[in-house]
Interface confidence: low
Amino acid sequence: FEIALPRESNITVLIKLGTPTLLAKPCYIVISKRHITMLSIKSGERIVFTFSCQSPENHFVIEIQKNIDCMSGPCPFGEVQLQPSTSLLPTLNRTFIWDVKAHKSIGLELQFSIPRLRQIGPGESCPDGVTHSISGRIDATVVRIGTFCSNGTVSRIKMQEGVKMALHLPWFHPRNVSGFSIANRSSIKRLCIIESVFEGEGSATLMSANYPEGFPEDELMTWQFVVPAHLRASVSFLNFNLSNCERKEERVEYYIPGSTTNPEVFKLEDKQPGNMAGNFNLSLQGCDQDAQSPGILRLQFQVLVQHPQNESNKIYVVDLSNERAMSLTIEPRPVKQSRKFVPGCFVCLESRTCSSNLTLTSGSKHKISFLCDDLTRLWMNVEKTISCTDHRYCQRKSYSLQVPSDILHLPVELHDFSWKLLVPKDRLSLVLVPAQKLQQHTHEKPCNTSFSYLVASAIPSQDLYFGSFCPGGSIKQIQVKQNISVTLRTFAPSFQQEASRQGLTVSFIPYFKEEGVFTVTPDTKSKVYLRTPNWDRGLPSLTSVSWNISVPRDQVACLTFFKERSGVVCQTGRAFMIIQEQRTRAEEIFSLDEDVLPKPSFHHHSFWVNISNCSPTSGKQLDLLFSVTLTPRTVDLT
């Protein structure tokens, strides 16, 4: 190999060992019959050398640095050449470095031809191995602007006081042009300006200078986004840190076309603007930091550009001004991530601050819109607390558990609407009365409606799930001892059509000791399946539940248990079941931890089934499933 560098070219070539590898044989640069591991070639030198091995690219790298001095004479502006030509260099991993020094008053602009650049974060690498590392200067301090790959949106980077550009090319890469040019500009009065051009839909992730380390103190950095007028841009902050400011405040400023309040100032912790039409600028402004404990300012953000969606011009009013203790969250439903570009799906408050999820609270009227290609990607979860603090005031008071129509009119599917029902301990209990009798969801008779009510204890220490209930059954009411949550969960978009079937009234009633009482009025045509609460985990220790089963005068009820034995093993206490005729008070008592469960029995009158648990040994839980079937009395039961 021969490398000859012209005089006054201000080029230095350095060949040195790369990152050490565990290769068996060492390799050397051979020059004048001497074996060396590093070779430096300066302007005006001509050197001939060889390598002592067949694949020097596994051992050595080459750095070509050109110093461009714009302080003492005119600057060589225009397209930057790769010198020496790559064809004259050994096939090693190559880094071309251009170090441009200029006056503070001179702006320097790097212009990148297509393909434009894409910024990468720490630890990331470029698919083709070609990287552009760009840094600037503040006095004597080097500031990293960023590392970039090809195929992105960054078209120009403007700096002042100097710029250092390093282009890294893998040994096998055929590239023989720098891909950029340098132009002079007037002073930009800030650290740098990065221009990012979108031709169509897409996204760009960008970072503050020095990221992930701290942004220089009291500096200003601007990103200019060029966006076709027919598209919309949204900004979201992926990661940021704030330093400890002594004077001034760290902030981002937007210059948004058409805004009457330019520049719009946001804190970094604010929701950032979305749904912006056309070009806009974003600037990051640092502060004077505390000398003792400066902390760091850093920012990584994403700009997402997409077509405006049909919904983006519609405003929906969610009036929660008359609600109390309620919150509504619109959020993405969990889905498998796709690697290809997926347009963002945002919900916007007042059409401007857009984010992937939004929580609205009671007491206000909210105006929202959507910036989303497919609203089925979002769903809604609502929580409302109804509490009674004074038992004298609440007793016999009723509340309707119904999804407000404002919420049903939103173009997003409702997932859960949860009511937390709180009562004063040992003073009051609750009764749930459905508009339409309920069916308990069981494996034997699953619910197939578009929604269900999930009823569970809301006492933190108590793990008690009463079950899932849907309209169209025989359960007339559910009484519960203490705090519960009732969640209306939807399973199909058809809930909108079936919404009229929802309707549950809760009343505060005098306190009773049983955990729950189910009032069941079976229909003559169907078999009613009932199961103990906490089906999968077993009825909690020392818990008692009852079913009040009505039998019409002209009917007979057949009570059937689906196991021969309960399976419960008691550690302390006894588990028992009482079946009591309500008219005669005659009762049968079964020891669930000892006796076999009763064979199918016939009841001519309304009756009670009460199940009380002991403290079971782990793994031997109490789970019972039983059914009630009505038949006309005229049938000969023998």
Epitope: G123, P334, K336, Q337
Partner: antibody, heavy 121, light 112 residues
Framework: QVTLKESGPGILQPSQTLSLTCSFS??????????VSWFRQPSGKGLEWLAH???????RYNPSLKSRLTISKDTSSNQVFLRITNVDTSDTATYYC?????????????WGQGTSVTVSS | DVLMTQTPLSLSVSLGDQASISCRSS???????????LEWYLQKPGQSPKLLIY???NRFSGIPDRFSGSGSGTDFTLKISRVEAEDLGIYYC?????????FGGGTKLEIK
């Protein structure tokens, strides 16, 4: 190539804290998708998963032992650590660390040879 | 916890014959991304476990094609089409879809 090696105290007494180190090479725990798990196996018995740490410092623990376990990592020195507090004789076992390389196999593709730990008074 | 039940407990097979090991999970082990993280490991005496099959049916690099995995939902099978002497040891199924990650009790493969 990928290797993992466990080290520990060998013997310790009940109620003491067991500290284990997994030193690895051939991969970096700063790579997206990488993770390291700890398992144990009492002599002649089956395997039990204890804890897992991901490249982004997210952690998973076996709920039955969670209150006693702490997993951590030092990415720069290629090490993962596991602490088990308040040990008793039932913690006597061979302890293994393993790599999960989700980019490649999404499974525990490489295991250390194990380190034997005896808890005895 | 997801209980992994392996059958049989031990298996005695002549060289060249087929061996089949079953693993049943107490609940479905499909993860939220659609993958079933069900693996098979072989632990030879005095050694650490070695990965054979990942994600139900994918062979790990360097594993001979006589090993195959199949199944879905809660029922999974490992088949060794022609048993060789080096295949003896304890085979474990393992799920990492749900925390805690759990192993089957193991199946000991012996050569007749």
């Amino acid at each position: 190539q990928v290797t993992l090696k466990e080290s520990g105290p060998g013997i310790l007494q009940p109620s003491q804290t067991l500290s284990l180190t997994c030193s690895f090479s051939g991969f970096s725990l700063s790579t997206s998708g990488m993770g390291v798990s700890w398992f144990r196996q009492p002599s002649g018995k089956g395997l039990e998963w204890l804890a897992h740490i991901y490249w982004d410092d997210d952690k998973r623990y076996n709920p039955s032992l969670k209150s006693r376990l702490t997993i951590s990592k030092d990415t720069s020195s290629n090490q993962v650590f596991l602490r088990i507090t308040n040990v008793d004789t039932s913690d006597t076992a061979t302890y293994y660390c393993t790599r999960e390389g989700s980019a490649d196999w999404e499974a525990l593709d490489y295991w250390g040879q194990g380190t034997s730990v005896t808890v005895s008074s | 916890d997801v209980l992994m039940t392996q059958t049989p407990l031990s298996l005695s097979v002549s060289l060249g014959d087929q061996a089949s090991i079953s693993c049943r999970s107490s609940q479905t082990i499909v993860y939220s991304n659609g993958n079933s993280y069900l693996e098979w490991y072989l632990q030879k005496p005095g050694q650490s476990p070695k990965l054979l099959i990942y994600k139900v049916s994918n062979r790990f690099s360097g594993i001979p094609d006589r090993f195959s995995g199949s199944g879905s939902g809660t029922d999974f099978t490992l088949k060794i089409s022609r048993v060789e002497a080096e295949d003896l040891g304890i085979y474990y199924c393992f799920q990492s879809s749900h925390v805690p990650w759990t192993f089957g009790g193991g199946t000991k493969l012996e050569i007749k």
